[in-house]
Interface confidence: low
């Protein structure tokens, strides 16, 4: 009988970390230094991402996966895929066009990034201020005066502050 010829693309046999080299009769060649292919059957390897300047390498490039960058100390990532590094500020500050500025009275920032947020308004929940707010910390709300009868619980812990900025959906 006549053997049927395989119609499969010979390049499909090239695993991740290699590329199908058209210059060498479609032989699977290893990716050159500083390049990678994360899937099989590729005709080229991609250049590794370089973590330069304010970026530092979080994960080295390998023949099968790209490098991942984060930011040097004093900076933090912004944007999808850490597309830039933004300067850190101190707690109690926020970054403005003119650099780090202290939070205005009535606002706080308990992190090195993000914006100053208003203190919690305890009275909206019918509670009183147990601990005053600062530039670095939110107020702590306590029970309302009416709740301070004998046997009543003394302190209601504050809800944890949400981190500002975008979080993945």
């Amino acid at each position: 009988f006549e053997r049927t010829r395989s119609l499969q693309d010979p390049c499909s046999n090239c695993p991740a970390g290699t590329f199908c080299d058209n210059n060498r009769n479609q032989i699977c060649s290893p990716c050159p230094p500083n390049s990678f292919s994360s899937a099989g059957g590729q005709r080229t390897c991609d250049i590794c991402r370089q973590c330069k300047g304010v970026f530092r390498t979080r994960k080295e490039c390998s023949s099968t996966s790209n490098a991942e960058c984060d930011c040097t100390p004093g900076f933090h990532c912004l944007g999808a895929g850490c597309s830039m590094c933004e300067q850190d500020c101190k707690q109690g500050q926020e970054l403005t066009k003119k650099g780090c500025k202290d939070c205005c009275f009535g606002t706080f920032n308990d992190q090195k990034r993000g914006i100053c947020r208003p203190w919690t308004n305890c009275s909206l929940d019918g509670k009183s201020v147990l601990v005053n707010g600062t530039k670095e910390r939110d107020v702590v709300c306590g029970p309302s005066p009416a709740d301070l009868s004998p046997g009543a619980s003394s302190v209601t812990p504050p809800a944890p502050a949400r981190e500002p900025g975008h979080s993945p959906q």
Epitope: S38, A39, D46, R49, Q50, G53, V54, G81, M84, P168
Partner: antibody
Framework: EVQLVESGGGLVQPGGSLRLSCVAS????????MNWVRQAPGKGLEWVSY????????YYAGSVKGRFTISRDNAKKSLYLHMNSLRAEDTAVYYC??????????????????WGQGTTVTVSS | DIQMTQSPSSLSASVGDRVTITCRAS??????LNWYQQKPGKAPKLLIY???SLQSGVPSRFSGSGSGTDFTLTISSLQPEDFATYYC??????????FGQGTRLEIK
């Protein structure tokens, strides 16, 4: 040739669903972050959704959050947008776009460097 | 979110003219600014990235400048194929990616 080809658009009633697909060729799809961008008739460009190259990080525009779902299948070199609870204001041409990275000495920049031809979604009763 | 505002919304010009389109960001975006060209019925095409770097294959009559909040796209000598809509886009703080509203360049 580096190429993105969208499909799956069509006419759908308000409240209905569609799934858009985008097939990549000519580049290592699994190495790139991808986005969906739409354009309502006679209007400008509006970003819809982002997915990282591994699919672990996802973002949505506020106007579609909770109704649209982005996903990808790197083995099939495909990007998807599942659209539920469609509204008249979702009527647009939907483009998939590759997020290319350009390295600078301090920062690195990204831009939408490859776009598909677009697929039209019409939401009407 | 960072807002991008382009001006003018539309303009008429003749072949050979020098044309400038401006884009303003609602806050400083350093040089994280891209420009796209879109012709009717077609997908957008990247022209300039990082405010002033020309994308491969784009004619040298296109140039970009600016940093911070104010940016310009300049076409030094308009050609017939340049009549299109142009969009700026910031990539400084994402998500969301935000675009300007577009500038339509028409033949006078």
């Amino acid at each position: 040739e580096v190429q993105l080809v969208e499909s799956g658009g069509g006419l759908v009633q308000p409240g209905g669903s569609l799934r858009l697909s985008c097939v990549a060729s000519g580049f290592t799809f699994s190495s790139y972050e991808m986005n969906w961008v739409r354009q309502a008739p006679g209007k400008g460009l509006e970003w819809v959704s982002y997915i990282s190259n591994s699919g672990t990080t996802i973002y949505y525009a506020g106007s579609v959050k909770g109704r649209f779902t982005i996903s990808r299948d790197n083995a099939k070199k495909s990007l998807y947008l599942h659209m539920n609870s469609l509204r008249a204001e979702d009527t647009a041409v939907y483009y998939c776009a590759r997020e290319g990275t350009i390295f600078g000495t301090v920062h690195y920049y990204f831009a939408l460097d490859v776009w598909g031809q677009g697929t039209t979604v019409t939401v009407s009763s | 979110d960072i807002q991008m505002t382009q001006s003018p919304s539309s303009l008429s010009a003749s072949v050979g003219d020098r044309v400038t389109i401006t884009c303003r960001a609602s806050q400083s975006i350093s040089s994280y600014l891209n420009w796209y060209q879109q012709k009717p019925g077609k997908a957008p095409k990247l022209l300039i990235y990082a405010a002033s770097s020309l994308q491969s294959g784009v004619p040298s009559r296109f140039s970009g400048s600016g940093s911070g909040t104010d940016f310009t796209l300049t076409i030094s000598s308009l050609q017939p194929e340049d009549f299109a809509t142009y969009y700026c886009q910031q990539s400084y703080s994402t998500p969301p990616i935000t675009f300007g509203q577009g500038t339509r360049l028409e033949i006078k």
